[in-house]
Amino acid sequence: APTSSSTKKTQLQLEHLLLDLQMILNGINNYKNPKLTRMLTFKFYMPKKATELKHLQCLEEELKPLEEVLNLAQSKNFHLRPRDLISNINVIVLELKGSETTFMCEYADETATIVEFLNRWITFCQSIISTLT
């Protein structure tokens, strides 16, 4: 059984991941630029199921495409540095799901926009945090 300290650590890591994803989404929503239309044409794979930490494998596999899309948004009004941001998220994801995981991600048939993708993983973090609180 997980100790209270390990649960606390997991909760904190999930909160960090949640905030990072919310920061990205906020940056995109604030982004009044023709580039936004182009960003929305990129398609992301969504997990068929995302209810456990091991399912973060599906997020990890989409971090590179996410970085590429965020690179489009670079301007003085977009305050997230994609390389730093994705690196930070990757570290958290690895710690949460465990780097030794052999879980094979299953994706849904339908792809999603960056906004739908971020909202899905934000909801994932929120639901797991709620069970830990």
Partner: antibody, heavy 113, light 107 residues
Framework: QVQLVQSGAEVKKPGASVKVSCKAS????????MHWVRQAPGQGLEWMGI????????SYALKFQGRVTMTRDTSTSTVYMELSSLRSEDTAVYYC??????WGQGTLVTVSS | DIQMTQSPSSLSASVGDRVTITCRAS??????LAWYQQKPGKAPKLLIY???SLDSGVPSRFSGSGSGTDFTLTISSLQPEDFATYYC?????????FGQGTKVEIK
């Protein structure tokens, strides 16, 4: 104990900039993201934005985008909030808060010609 | 942005009274709601997080309930030190938003 100590009150002229500091102590600085919230006299609370203290990236409320810059100095466990092109309606108490349960004492910024 | 609407905006009560403040979100925020107490010239103080969890050191006379769009802060027996302004806040999505506040005054 865990605390956030902010810089002192400021009086600025319209069009000027102000930089408020918030020094953290009693906890690992990079553990909690830092939010900035302001409160105009007799008014409610207004979220301005957030900074990730480890990586330094930020996200701002649309209302302040283009005028606000949040930075951090990990060597001194200090976060900064700079607001430019000040106008009279920016007169407010500015708070930093870490994890929402720890708040700075507030910094009164008065904008007056 | 998610709008948070508190009611009433002010109320008068006596020591020992049961006080209820409500907060409504413009869309569902699950239980991503916090309540703060603020006294004049002081920073807000977290009372309740996750809609119903009491922050450490907060007296048990304070309680929170609700989920989705409707939330309640209850003070079971008002004490002299409870006269203050109370704010609800959602952190379900950015931008974080607050209710306009409820001022609890002495009757």
């Amino acid at each position: 104990q865990v605390q956030l100590v902010q810089s002192g009150a400021e009086v600025k002229k319209p069009g000027a900039s102000v930089k408020v500091s918030c020094k953290a102590s009693g906890y690992t600085f990079t553990t909690y993201y830092m939010h900035w919230v302001r409160q105009a006299p007799g008014q409610g609370l207004e979220w301005m934005g957030i900074i990730n203290p480890r990586a330094g990236y930020t996200s701002y409320a649309l209302k302040f985008q283009g005028r606000v810059t949040m930075t951090r100095d990990t060597s001194t466990s200090t976060v900064y909030m700079e607001l430019s092109s000040l106008r009279s309606e920016d007169t407010a108490v500015y708070y930093c808060t870490s994890g929402w349960d720890v708040w700075g004492q507030g910094t009164l910024v008065t904008v007056s010609s | 942005d998610i709008q948070m609407t508190q009611s009433p905006s002010s109320l008068s009560a006596s020591v020992g009274d049961r006080v209820t403040i409500t907060c409504r979100a413009s869309q569902s925020i699950s239980t991503w709601l916090a309540w703060y107490q603020q006294k004049p010239g002081k920073a807000p103080k977290l009372l309740i997080y996750a809609a119903s969890s009491l922050d450490s050191g907060v007296p048990s006379r304070f309680s929170g309930s609700g989920s989705g769009t409707d939330f309640t802060l209850t003070i079971s027996s008002l004490q002299p030190e409870d006269f203050a302004t109370y704010y609800c806040q959602q952190s379900y999505s950015f931008p974080v938003t607050f209710g306009q506040g409820t001022k609890v005054e002495i009757k």
